[in-house]
Interface confidence: low
């Protein structure tokens, strides 16, 4: 007798395919491009999302750096190579065996080399800095509530634990949000503060990653917050290892 | 604090059908499976089925298919079996069991319904 | 369906004692990827169910290290050292690998 589930979907990733093949016949998904399985109760790491999104086109960008030692994610789309966790293998190569080392949210942070490059460990961003420009409105947002407001989207869309969520600033029409997550602190089951940057970024840009959920509708007291620009620094423990080349560049 | 709080106890007839509610509070309601389990007096017990709030997903022992129906109130995080066509061999106590979606046990239960069939 | 098989039936003990009950299963729980989920649960007189061990040998948060679970494949044992007062009532082994189903309980009583 098996208990095969009638409605077989990953409410968290809609880059899966799911069969009534897990425990007990539970519904078990397997992210595209990858194979693996995931949990579909959290969100999916941002690594096996990557791999799944390697058919989309290249987004590349250039920002302006907030710190010396942050990092903007400038080469856009790549298949990178995930370990058996989902996290993003500490060396990335491409097809032409040109290889680079990347943090954990899969962020370039050396030069790129060749297949002798050694990237001994995974460095982790600890810190993530959203900065968002909303569209113009009549007045600005009132500060606590929308502190209030992205705060709860954090925790409920994303269920990320509200202590990672370090500060949200405001000066018309900008927005920070503040992500601090270190080693120490985060616990078996705490969500990534980069996996939920990732999914908040995707929300951003009307390319929800929820399966079935109606995309994203941030209001403020009722007023619609429209953001026309997104930029994302990242931070890592370690200070990134790029030459003098590049830093003057 | 998980707490799952299930309906009093429900005397019925038999070939009636009956209704028994599981509410549910500490937790994310639509991140965990709910089980169903039946135990009849001094005995064991016995898996009904699963459903995933959630999406609405179930999954039913087959010897229940047909006689127990899962459903959920999302909106006030509140789990639901229907038992229809009530025989003297459905007089069970029944429990409500939050699953975890890591190891697949049943890590909190509410205190259960007892229906008493009986003409 | 899976068939879990416990012995024994009831485990008189004296307090301070060990006691040991075995679950045995008619097919490996070994699932396909790679966990085996045996779980015991403890049902004490008038309560409902509560998650002692999952996953073979793991302790639900807040049971005590007096409990301990151990095995493979199709056999499994619940020890408890030093037994108190509070530990009396009927343990249910139970898999989850397959369709859902738990063994017929051993009572653990005061001799």
């Known amino acids: 007798h098996t208990a095969a589930q009638d409605n077989c979907t990953c409410p968290t990733n809609k880059m899966t395919v799911c069969s009534p093949d897990g425990p007990g016949g539970r519904c078990q998904c397997r992210a595209l491009g990858s194979g693996m399985a995931v949990d579909c109760s959290t969100l999916t790491s941002k690594c096996l999302l990557l791999k799944a999104r390697m058919s989309a086109p290249k987004n590349a960008r250039t920002l302006v750096r907030p710190s010396e030692h942050a990092l903007v994610d400038n080469d856009g789309l790549y298949d990178p190579d995930c370990d058996p966790e989902g996290r993003f293998k500490a060396r990335q190569c491409n097809q032409t065996s040109v290889c680079w080392c990347v943090n954990s949210v899969g962020v370039r942070r050396t030069d790129k080399g060749d297949l002798s490059l050694r990237c001994d460990e995974l460095v982790r961003t600890h810190h993530i800095l959203i900065d968002l420009r909303h569209r113009p409105t009549a007045g600005a947002f009132n500060h606590s509530d929308l502190d209030a407001e992205l705060r709860r989207l954090f925790r409920e869309r994303y269920r990320l634990h509200p202590k990672f969520v370090a500060a949200v600033h405001y000066e018309q029409p900008t927005i920070q949000i503040e992500l601090r997550q270190n080693t120490s602190q985060k616990a078996a089951g705490d969500v990534d503060i980069g996996d939920a940057a990732y999914y908040f970024e995707r929300d951003i840009k009307g390319e929800s990653l929820f399966q079935g959920r109606g995309g994203l509708d941030l209001r403020v007291r009722g007023e619609p917050l429209q953001v026309e620009r997104t930029l994302i620094y990242y931070l890592d423990e370690i200070p990134p290892k790029f030459s003098m080349k590049r830093l003057t560049a | 604090e998980v707490q799952l709080q299930q309906s009093g106890p429900e005397p019925v007839k038999p070939g009636a059908s009956v209704k028994m509610s599981c509410k549910a509070s500490?937790?994310?309601?639509?991140?965990?499976?709910m089980n169903w389990v039946k135990q009849s007096h001094g005995k064991s017990l016995e898996w009904i089925g699963y459903?995933?709030?959630?999406?609405?997903?179930?999954g039913y022992n087959q010897k229940f298919k047909g006689k127990a129906t899962l459903t959920v109130d999302k909106s006030s995080s509140t789990a639901y079996m229907e038992l229809r066509s009530l025989t003297s061999e459905d007089s069970a106590v029944y429990y409500c069991?939050?699953?975890?979606?890591?190891?697949?046990?049943?890590?909190?239960w509410g205190q259960g319904t007892s229906v008493t069939v009986s003409s | 369906d899976v068939v879990m098989t416990q012995t024994p039936l009831s485990l008189p003990v004296s307090l301070g004692d060990q006691a040991s009950i075995s679950c045995k299963s008619s097919?490996?729980?070994?699932?396909?990827?790679?966990?085996?989920?045996l779980h015991w649960y403890l049902q004490k007189p008038g309560q409902s169910p509560k998650l002692l061990i999952y996953?073979?040998?793991n302790r639900f948060s807040g049971v005590p290290d007096r409990f301990s679970g151990s095995g493979s494949g199709t056999d499994f044992t619940l020890k408890i050292n030093r037994v108190e007062a509070e530990d009396l009532g009927v343990y249910f082994c139970?898999?989850?690998?397959?369709?859902?189903?738990f063994g017929g309980g051993t009572k653990l009583e005061i001799k």
């Open positions: 069991a939050r699953e975890d979606s890591y190891y697949y046990a049943m890590d909190y």
């Open positions: 500490g937790y994310t309601f639509t991140d965990y499976y």
């Open positions: 459903i995933y709030p959630n999406n609405g997903a179930t």
């Open positions: 097919q490996s729980l070994v699932h396909s990827n790679g966990n085996t989920f």
């Open positions: 996953k073979v040998s």
């Open positions: 139970s898999q989850s690998t397959h369709v859902y189903t």
